[in-house]
């Protein structure tokens, strides 16, 4: 089941999935002046079997002015700059996403890709939040959001993260070492069915994640 909405927006923060559940779609969007090749794929789809998942279809962009040149190679560094990048406080070694059954890695960029990626997440997907450069994280609980199915409708849990400017940190005394408080999750789950999957895998993965470089903005 696809999630009906985007993950919640947190001021001065970006989110990223460390791995994408099977069924996730990524639209093949091209930057201005370029378009998908004729009869080209509309999206990439994370799919596969129980032992291996990968992205089906390839996104290819070509100049709007020409008809026969197709591009799908990795961008050169100067082209890469066109993509929205939000660098976090310190880089990390990415989690080995291949070890997550039923998940795909971050799809590599394609040449002349649009600056913003449009993902379609599925129920059970977890995304992780971090403050943008120049802001620091004040945690009141997990800095993550999960797409859940409740009463037949999908919703994202609210990440417990506040991003504050460096100059403002003094107004939050005692928050130097962030801790998750027991009342950190505002939503209390009712007795109705909540369909989620892969929580344990995702949570274990989150434990290894301190900071990362988010290379794309997500819609």
């Amino acid at each position: 089941e696809l999630c009906d909405d985007d993950p919640p927006e947190i001021p001065h923060a970006t989110f990223k999935a460390m791995a994408y559940k099977e069924g996730t779609m990524l639209n093949c969007e091209c930057k201005r002046g370029f378009r998908r090749i004729k009869s080209g794929s509309l999206y990439m789809l994370c799919t596969g079997n129980s032992s291996h998942s990968s992205w089906d279809n390839q996104c290819q962009c070509t100049s709007s002015a020409t008809r026969n040149t197709t591009k799908q190679v990795t961008p050169q560094p100067e082209e890469q700059k066109e993509r929205k990048t939000t660098e976090m406080q310190s880089p990390m070694q990415p989690v080995d996403q291949a070890s997550l059954p039923g998940h795909c890695r971050e799809p590599p960029p394609w040449e002349n890709e649009a600056t913003e990626r449009i993902y379609h997440f599925v129920v059970g997907q977890m995304v992780y939040y971090q403050c943008v450069q120049g802001y620091r994280a004040l945690h009141r609980g997990p800095a993550e959001s999960v797409c859940k199915m409740t009463h037949g409708k999908t919703r994202w849990t609210q990440p417990q993260l506040i991003c504050t400017g460096e100059m403002e940190t003094s107004q939050f005394p005692g928050e130097e070492k962030p801790q998750a408080s027991p009342e950190g999750r505002p939503e209390s789950e009712t007795s109705c069915l909540v369909t989620t999957t892969d929580f344990q895998i995702q949570t274990e993965m989150a434990a290894t994640m301190e900071t990362s470089i988010f290379t794309t903005e997500y819609q």
Epitope: L2, D4, D5, G23, M25, N27, E29, S39, S41, L42, Y43, L45, T47, D56, N57, I118, H120
Partner: antibody, heavy 117, light 104 residues
């Protein structure tokens, strides 16, 4: 529940245009690609094109490019397919269908378009 | 452009029979989808990713194949399976021309 309800049958003269609508309900209209597929009597299914209502991105089959225009009204959760310069071989049942990624999971009931002088 | 060629075009079969429909792609593909269309109805999804059954599809329907050759198999055919079956390629949105199954 998800439903795609299409407009009624049309009879058109050669050279005219036809605009078929597809009203979606029961899901978030802007987040799924919507496709148009046609089926001439006793013939194959033919993909015509698709639209992503979230940003009005479209893709058309080369066979129909220049003659087909697919649009979406997000406020009405309705997709439209307009085919111009009609000829007799455009007589067909036209379907809208929602793209679930793996497959087209929901289809409209079909709209019969007859082109006859 | 990819062309999907189905065979046979038409098959008349008796209930409980095993039916095999093939679909050949003009170039190698990673996955194939199959749809069922009954008279005066819209197509209905049956098999996706070559061998996965869509929800609610009876277990007698199965798919297999790789590269350019793909197969839809109906084990122990039932009267309600009288329909036209189409293979479909997701990345190019190409459909085969269908195999019509008639129940004797």
């Amino acid at each position: 529940q998800v439903q795609l309800v299409q407009s009624g049958a049309e009879v058109k003269k050669p050279g005219a245009s036809v605009k078929v609508s597809c009203k979606a309900s029961g899901y978030s209209f802007t987040r799924y690609w919507m496709h148009w597929v046609r089926q001439p009597p006793g013939q194959c299914l033919e993909w015509m094109g698709a639209i992503y209502p979230g940003n009005s991105d479209t893709s058309y089959s080369q066979k129909f490019e220049g003659r087909v225009t697919i649009t979406a009204d997000t406020s009405a959760s309705t997709a439209y397919m307009e085919l111009s310069s009609l000829r007799s071989e455009d007589t067909a049942v036209y379907y809208c269908s929602r793209d679930y990624g793996y497959y087209f999971d929901f289809w409209g009931q079909g709209t019969t378009v007859t082109v006859s002088s | 452009e990819i062309v999907l060629t189905q065979s046979p075009d038409f098959q008349s079969v008796t209930p409980k029979e095993k039916v095999t429909i093939t679909c050949r792609a003009s170039s190698s593909r990673s996955y194939m989808q199959w749809y069922q269309q009954k008279p005066d109805q819209s197509p209905k999804r049956l098999i996706y990713d070559t061998s996965k059954s869509a929800s609610g599809v009876p277990s007698r329907f199965s798919g297999s194949g790789s590269g350019t050759d793909y197969t839809l198999t109906i084990n122990s055919l039932e009267a309600e399976d009288a329909a036209t079956y189409y293979c479909h390629q997701r990345s190019s949105y190409t459909f085969g021309c269908g195999t019509k199954l008639e129940i004797k």
